[in-house]
Amino acid sequence: CKAMHVAQPAVVLASSRGIASFVCEYASPGKATEVRVTVLRQADSQVTEVCAATYMMGNELTFLDDSICTGTSSGNQVNLTIQGLRAMDTGLYICKVELMYPPPYYLGIGNGTQIYVIDPEPCPDSDF
C-alpha cells in the first residue's frame, strides 16, 4: 500500500506549567534521509500550523528560535514537546510527516492528539 501510517496518542494532559509532550511515530515506506514534521492544531474546524521542523535522519529536529515546540528524533519516532500552553489552547494537535528526500515523496497524517490544558489556580495571598 503506497501510503504512510502515522501514529500518535489519542489524549495528553498538559502539565500545570503548560507543557505537553507526545510521540509521533511513522511507518516509513522508504528510506528517507530528510523528514519534515509539522504540528497542526484543529479547533472549531479551523486549522492552524503550530510549528514545523525539517531534519536529517540521525540529526536533531531544529525548530525556529521563536517556536513553542521542541523535539527529538529516534529512528521513525519523533518526541514532540509544546510549551506555553493555556486553557484556550486546548484542542486536537495533529502530527503531519513528510518524507522529503530522496524520492518518492510520502505524506502521512496522524489522527491527532487531544491536548487538554487547565490553567493553574492562582495562589491565594498568605499572611505569614
Epitope: 503506497k2 501510503a3 486549522v47 500550523e49 497524517i109
Partner: antibody, heavy 115, light 108 residues
C-alpha cells in the same frame, strides 16, 4: 484571502523557452508547497512539478524532467516555472496550486495559456 | 505511479437526481490521501473533498465522499444546475501526484 495569479504564458515556437510566474498573497508563502498543474485543450489535469517550503526539495513529472525547472522566491511570494525545449505537446493552460495543510490542492490560480 | 481510473466517462442526469462517480486506483492507496475536484468550463478546478470524505471549506453537504482500498466514490445527493461540470479524483499521498481522467456530469 488566499490568491494565486499566474502570468507569462503566450505563443512560442517549438524548441524555445518561456518562464511562467505565480504571485501568491493572503497566506504565509514559505509554509506551503506549491505545484504546477497543466491541462491540454479539451483534456484532463496533469501534474507537472512541485517545490516545497524553502525551495530545496523539488519533484517533476517524467514528461518534463530535464526540460522544466521549478523555483520560488519566498521574499517575493512568487513561484516560477522555467520551460525549455518546448514541444507541441506542452500546449496547455498552466495552473499553480497550493498544497493545503492536509495535502490536497486547496487553492488554484486562474491559469495561463501556453501555446 | 498510481493510475486512477474514473467511471463513467460521462453521466447524463437531470437536476434533482443523485449522481454517483467512481474512482479506482491501480494499487491500494490510503483513502486518507484521496481528493475530488470540480471544474467548470473556463475555470480552475475547485477542491470538493479531501481525505476521501472530508468536505473542503464552503462545499455544500449534498457532496459526499467515501471509499477505501482501491475504490472511492463521490456522491451528489440532489443535482443543482451549478453542479453540472467535470469531476476529477486525485491521490496526493505519494509522488508523482496523479489525477483520474475525469467524469463529465451533463444535463440529460
Amino acid at each position: 484571502q488566499v490568491q494565486l495569479v499566474e502570468s507569462g504564458g503566450g505563443v512560442v515556437q517549438p524548441g524555445r523557452s518561456l518562464r511562467l510566474s505565480c504571485a501568491a498573497s493572503g497566506f504565509t508563502f514559505s509554509s506551503y508547497g506549491i505545484h504546477w498543474v497543466r491541462q491540454a485543450p479539451g483534456k484532463g489535469l496533469e501534474w507537472v512539478a512541485v517545490i516545497w517550503y524553502d525551495g530545496r526539495n523539488k519533484y517533476y513529472a517524467d514528461s518534463v524532467k530535464g526540460r522544466f525547472t521549478i523555483s520560488r522566491d519566498n521574499s517575493k511570494n512568487t513561484l516560477y516555472l522555467q520551460m525549455n525545449s518546448l514541444r507541441a505537446e506542452d500546449t496547455a493552460v498552466y495552473y499553480c496550486a497550493r498544497a493545503g495543510n492536509w495535502g490536497p490542492f486547496d487553492s488554484w490560480g486562474q491559469g495561463t495559456l501556453v501555446t | 505511479e498510481i493510475v486512477l481510473t474514473q467511471s463513467p466517462g460521462t453521466l447524463s442526469l437531470s437536476p434533482g437526481e443523485r449522481a454517483t462517480l467512481s474512482c479506482r486506483a491501480s494499487q491500494s492507496v490510503s483513502s486518507s490521501y484521496l481528493a475530488w475536484y470540480q471544474q467548470k468550463p473556463g475555470q480552475a478546478p475547485r477542491l470538493l473533498i479531501y481525505g476521501a470524505s472530508s468536505r473542503a471549506t464552503g462545499i455544500p453537504d449534498r457532496f459526499s465522499g467515501s471509499g477505501s482500498g482501491t475504490d472511492c466514490t463521490l456522491a451528489i445527493s440532489r443535482l443543482e444546475p451549478e453542479d453540472f461540470a467535470v469531476y476529477y479524483c486525485q491521490q496526493y499521498g505519494s509522488s508523482p501526484w496523479t489525477f483520474g481522467q475525469g467524469t463529465k456530469v451533463e444535463i440529460k
